[in-house]
């Protein structure tokens, strides 16, 4: 998980950071770009049907450290990544859904998505 804001020197952060926004654009955004004093983020989560939906946008500086920490929420599969190193840096983020815990299998028979390596076809 990238939390580049934690390792980037404060002076390297632009005063105003422009981020790609999708499903999470403020009304005054233009061309799917928002501005913030904090972080850009990209988040993936599952809707009620099990469909993965990606949202991206801006997080204000206040409280964003906590939001970017991606604390697990029981019974909710989601993942968030944040960045600050350059404008629109969140278009390069690629959060992936966390693996299912055993108890989640009550929701149905699931085939795991294997990222970045060969996947044996069932």
């Amino acid at each position: 998980k990238k939390e580049d804001g934690e390792s980037t020197a404060p002076t390297a952060r632009p005063k105003v950071l422009r981020c790609k926004c999708h499903h999470h654009c403020p009304e005054d955004s233009v061309n799917n770009i928002c501005s913030t004093d904090g972080y850009c983020f990209t988040m993936i989560e599952e809707d009620d049907s099990g469909t993965p939906v990606v949202t991206s946008g801006c997080l204000g500086l206040e409280g964003s450290d906590f939001q970017c920490r991606d604390t697990p929420i029981p019974h909710q599969r989601r993942s968030i990544e944040c960045c600050t190193e350059r404008n629109e840096c969140n278009k390069d983020l690629h959060p992936t859904l966390p693996p299912l815990k055993d108890r989640d299998f009550v929701d149905g028979p699931i085939h795991h998505k294997h990222h970045h390596h060969h996947h044996h076809h069932h």
Partner: antibody
Framework: QIQLVQSGPELKKPGETVKISCKAS????????MNWVKQAPGKGLKWMGW????????AYADDFKGRFAFSLETFASTAYLQINNLRDEDTATYFC????????????WGTGTTVTVSS | SFVMTQTPKFLLVSAGDRVTITCKAS??????VAWYQQKPGQSPRLLIY???NRYTGVPDRFTGSGYGTDFTFTISTVQAEDLAVYFC?????????FGSGTKLEIK
């Protein structure tokens, strides 16, 4: 042999309703999702949404919310696409396509159903 | 939504040629890209999934590669039966989007 066999071509008038079926065989129906993909004449492929064959919960792409409905008859291993209040721009071939739950590539495709909307 | 920019739109090649099709994504997809073949009058057929994995029964002349935003599909030695339209698809996030297609014609 895994197959998705769809119902035959449909000729409809604007404002009418069509219901397309997709009969699955050769695998356990409820362990895969069923997607619907639209292909207008001479055009590319557009994902309309899917229905979770285990839970029965559908999800629709934004362009297909409202007049479109996915449903299942699990006991018959059949998925359905219903389009209400048909418009000229609904003229297309509609494919059902199977996907593993939580994977989103489509490994088996239906035979396709051509819907023509014309007054 | 994620835009898949596929090039070229048309390819006119001779049997035995090597063919390369590219897809560029508007955002990072990791390896969540599939490639399909659609022959005239037929349904699409899965060839490649997870960017580089060949699906069951697909000849090894078909290969895929790439990660992030840039993906490539290659037919190492084109055969007459490869006449078709080829599509890429991102399978990372809803709505799952396809490239506009590449029509492969054989001289």
């Amino acid at each position: 042999q895994i197959q998705l066999v769809q119902s035959g071509p449909e000729l409809k008038k604007p404002g009418e309703t069509v219901k397309i079926s997709c009969k699955a065989s050769g695998y356990t129906f409820t362990t895969y999702g069923m997607n619907w993909v639209k292909q207008a004449p001479g055009k590319g492929l557009k994902w309309m949404g899917w229905i979770n064959s285990y839970s029965g919960v559908p999800a629709y792409a934004d362009d297909f919310k409202g007049r479109f409905a996915f449903s299942l008859e699990t006991f018959a291993s059949t998925a359905y696409l219903q389009i209400n209040n048909l418009r000229d721009e609904d003229t297309a071939t509609y494919f059902c396509a199977r996907s593993e739950l939580r994977n989103w590539y489509f490994d088996v495709w239906g035979t396709g159903t051509t819907v023509t909307v014309s007054s | 939504s994620f835009v898949m920019t596929q090039t070229p739109k048309f390819l006119l090649v001779s049997a035995g040629d090597r063919v390369t099709i590219t897809c560029k994504a508007s955002q990072n997809l990791g390896n969540d890209v599939a490639w399909y073949q659609q022959k005239p009058g037929q349904s699409p057929r899965l060839l490649i999934y997870f960017a580089s994995n060949r699906y069951t029964g697909v000849p090894d002349r078909f290969t895929g590669s790439g990660y992030g935003t840039d993906f490539t599909f290659t037919i190492s030695t084109v055969q007459a039966e490869d006449l078709a339209v080829y599509f890429c698809q991102q399978d990372y996030s809803s709505p799952f989007t396809f490239g506009s297609g590449t029509k492969l014609e054989i001289k």
